[in-house]
Interface confidence: medium
């Protein structure tokens, strides 16, 4: 029997019942419960929370809830030997030291086990030397320094401001520039919104606040010691020298009070332009070294953190499907936090908890989804997406055959202005249709749909009357599912106004001040934005698990493929002479995109007309839709990034958080004018065009009539 026959409830009624059961008050209660103490990965507190969630999901009515544990490489400060940075005089005396901890927020003064700010996976070391200010430490910042300003970072300690790109990319760039240490700091220009008070009086970063975070360059590998395979009881582990993605130079984060002390003495070159100036009252001189009076003073780092193999725990809950139990729709978000996790991750975990409760309520009333829904509370996301990646590595054979979709559920909010969605093009129509059915929580949009407020506040730059939906990048737990396994994925949260708020992320990200009170007082007192995000995430899961025909539209992939092909062609056409010299043609790619467009259009017509009462034909059509995302996977992966296997999308090589389209071609073209062997470089461009064209054509053929 189908799930609808089993319960005599119409699909529309089911969806309404599911959405109506979601309550803002419950999300608020769960958030409070999850944020009273730190839940750092690998700690007893986080293990206890895993067991609590396991127990509650069982009570909510899931069919089974299991813990999946792995032993992975984590990183912690040395409790008796703290990390800090000092300014030393010519005699080696420390004349200034950075703070050892953040001043705790009101009400949390007596909480134990608050990990002090540190850069996870930094090696130990005590380098000393002259300082060079490198702006955001982006690729283009080092180009400016090295090529235009002729400033050599070799043997220097660099200081970079957080923001714009993933911190691991900053560290990689500094290493490649020859730096011997990296200091990361939060500049008020990026983490202090004008007209807003510092925490606890507002949502801005105080001068003593510091952003924690890992500085790995894993490129999708998961546990650094067991790339490609689960870190289970019988795992073979690499030696630390062969571990994937570890930084080779000491790194440490500081707040802007401490940064002021380091930057105010900087001498050497003036900043190249205004884009290198933040908001501190310092000259933002690049260096190297301190100015005249202080030229004999140096900076010294003291880093004593250790890397340790530690047990982590995922919670995996199952709600078995009534009709297609071997088709999995996954809702996952992480549980581990740097400190209290008021936003990251518990604003997401609280939403997942309420979604599980609502599904459980329906199940207790006799309903089941058509397909199986898996719920996951991931561990060690903050240490490199480790919990999700290890679980996916362990279950990769099942997932690649049975995985329909993955919906991510980290932070539900990063602002309270409008919706933000990043997803596969296959989900565009699902998101549009769902948000048209949901009420907007926004002031001034009472009685209007979420789609309407979202479109007004975040319009598509291309299609009038439609909202912006972005590419998936990385930096979160969907990575292994989408970039490695090719499972259709999406994420949704409430965001800030990107027009007026230029700061990076939200100001208190990964600081001790990310508390329950931050959310309850300043971001979402009524929890109405959390509820809306629960409705979007839960509604997507509901539709993906319950609709008879999968709610994927392959025509939307055709549209973006054409756009991405146009974009990469235009990048290449900046080098018309070389294109001619090396006979570089994009004809094969444009031809493949054209074929994909035509075949997708015909498939969509067949999808309207086929006999949905024939279970074999229905399953066949759904399988073609499910496996379309999989068809974009190249088993050989991208050059030097074997776990990034999606040919259409990958995290940018210059910013893990951002998505890049046709990444193989893009990387081959990047800075090609500086390559020592142009013939080889353009040969690689041609090879990447070939791989892309073949993959698009092969994907198109999966949508053709089967015989």
């Amino acid at each position: 029997k189908s799930s609808n026959e089993a319960t005599n409830i119409t699909p529309k009624h089911n969806m309404k019942a599911f959405l109506d059961e979601l309550k803002a008050e419950n999300i608020k209660k769960f958030l409070y419960n999850f944020t009273q103490i730190p839940h750092l990965a690998g700690t007893e507190q986080n293990f206890q929370l895993a067991k609590q969630i396991q127990s509650q999901w069982k009570e909510f009515g899931l069919d089974s809830v299991e813990l999946a544990h792995y032993d992975v490489l984590l990183s912690y400060p040395n409790k008796t030997h703290p990390n800090y940075i000092s300014i030393i005089n010519e005699d080696g005396n420390e004349i200034f030291n950075t703070s050892l901890f953040e001043p705790p927020p009101p009400g949390y003064e007596n909480v134990s086990d608050i990990v002090p700010p540190f850069s996870a996976f930094s090696p130990q070391g005590m380098p000393e030397g002259d300082l060079v200010y490198v702006n955001y430490a982006r690729t283009e910042d080092f180009f400016k320094l090295e090529r235009d300003m002729k400033i050599n970072c070799s043997g220097k300690i660099v200081i970079a401001r957080y923001g714009k790109v993933f911190r691991g990319n900053k560290v990689k760039n500094a290493q490649l520039a020859g730096a011997k240490g990296v200091i990361l700091y939060s500049d008020p220009a990026d983490y202090f919104a004008p007209g807003v008070k510092s925490y606890p009086d507002g949502w801005n970063l105080p001068g003593g606040g510091v952003q924690r975070g890992n500085i790995l360059n894993l490129n999708g590998a998961g546990d650094p010691l067991t790339p490609g395979y689960p870190a289970n009881e019988y795992a073979y582990r690499r030696g630390i020298a062969e571990a994937v993605g570890l930084p080779s130079i000491p790194v440490h984060p500081i707040g802007y009070y401490d940064a002021q002390k380091l930057l105010e003495k900087m001498g050497g070159s003036a900043p190249p332009d205004s884009s290198w100036r933040g908001s501190l009252k310092v000259p933002y001189n690049v260096g190297p070294g301190f100015t005249g009076n202080f030229s004999t003073q140096k900076v010294k780092m003291h880093i004593h953190s250790t890397n340790e193999v530690t047990r982590i725990y995922n919670v995996i809950g199952t709600l078995r499907g009534a009709v297609e139990p071997d088709r999995y729709v996954i809702l996952g978000g992480h549980r581990d936090s740097w400190v209290f996790g008021g936003i990251d991750p518990q604003s997401g975990a609280a939403v997942v908890h309420e979604i599980v409760r609502s599904f459980g309520t329906l199940k207790k009333e006799g309903w089941r989804p058509r397909r199986t829904i898996l719920f996951a509370s991931w561990d060690a996301e903050e240490f490199g997406l480790l919990g999700s990646t290890e679980w996916a590595e362990e279950n990769s054979r099942l997932l690649q055959e049975r995985g329909v979709a993955y919906i991510n559920a980290d932070s539900s909010i990063e602002g309270n202005y409008t919706l933000r969605v990043d997803c596969t093009p296959l989900m565009y129509s699902l998101v549009h249709n769902l948000t048209k059915e949901l009420k907007s929580p926004d002031e001034g949009f009472e009685g209007k749909s979420l789609y309407e407020s979202w479109t007004k506040k975040s319009p598509s730059p291309e299609f009038s009357g439609m909202p912006r939906i972005s590419k998936l990048g990385s930096g979160n737990d969907f990575e292994v599912f989408f970039q490695r396994l090719g499972i259709a994925s999406g994420r949704a949260r409430y965001t800030k106004n990107w027009e007026t708020n230029k700061f990076s992320g939200y100001p208190l990200y990964h600081s001790v001040y990310e508390t329950y009170e931050l959310v309850e007082k300043f971001y979402d007192p009524m929890f109405k934005y959390h509820l809306t995000v629960a409705q979007v995430r839960g509604g997507m899961v509901f539709e993906l698990a319950n609709s008879i025909v999968l709610p994927f539209d392959c025509r939307d992939y055709a549209v973006v493929l054409r756009k991405y092909a146009d974009k990469i062609y235009s990048i290449s056409m900046k080098h018309p002479q070389e294109m001619k010299t090396y006979s570089v043609s994009f004809d094969s790619l444009f031809s493949a995109v054209k074929n994909f467009t035509e075949i997708a259009s015909k498939f969509s017509e067949r999808l309207q007309d086929f006999d949905k009462s024939n279970p074999i034909v229905l399953r066949m059509m759904n399988d073609q839709l499910m496996f379309l995302e999989r068809a974009f996977i190249d088993p050989l992966g991208l050059p030097d990034r074997p776990f990034y296997r999606h040919v259409i999308y990958a995290p940018s090589s210059h910013n893990k958080y951002a998505g890049e389209s046709f990444p193989g071609i893009y990387d081959a073209l990047f800075d090609i004018e500086s390559k020592v062997d142009p013939s080889k470089a353009w040969g690689e461009v041609k090879r990447q065009i070939y791989v892309a064209a073949f993959t698009v054509q092969a994907a198109a053929e999966t949508l053709s009539e089967v015989a």
Epitope: P461, E462, S470, T495, W498, K567, Y569, S570, A658, S661
Partner: nanobody
């Protein structure tokens, strides 16, 4: 850091053509993946999208203004322009040029310039 600056007359007579230019500094206007757009804000109202030119040359206009709008680009000067014909008092607004892109955070806007339509 890319910066945008609008320039043009602040006063235009009814039925004439409003002409504005946006100068882009700190980055190339032919940089792939970006949309160079014009938007306007009537006094006390929200932003209204006028149109944009994509890096590959394709141009899109707001359907309600399409018959009166022309957007063009001069890559040699790193500028793009707006022409709005047959203006009326209803076209009085602050006009902004902007850069947009596929991703969040790509959006940049100029300071804006007030254009008043009056005889």
């Amino acid at each position: 850091q890319v910066q945008l600056q609008e320039s043009g007359p602040g006063l235009v007579k009814p039925s004439q053509t409003l002409s504005l230019t946006c100068t882009v500094s700190g980055g190339s206007i032919s940089n792939s993946g970006y949309y160079w757009s014009w938007v306007r804000q009537h006094p006390g109202k929200g932003l209204e999208w006028i149109g944009f030119i994509y890096y590959n040359g394709s141009i899109h206009y707001n359907p309600s203004l399409k018959s009166r709008v022309t957007i063009s680009v001069d890559t040699s000067k790193n500028q793009f322009s707006l022409k709005l014909s047959s203006v009326t008092a209803a076209d009085t607004a602050v006009y902004y040029c902007a850069r947009d892109g596929d991703d969040y955070g790509d959006y940049l806007r100029g300071q804006g310039t007030l254009v008043t339509v009056s005889s």
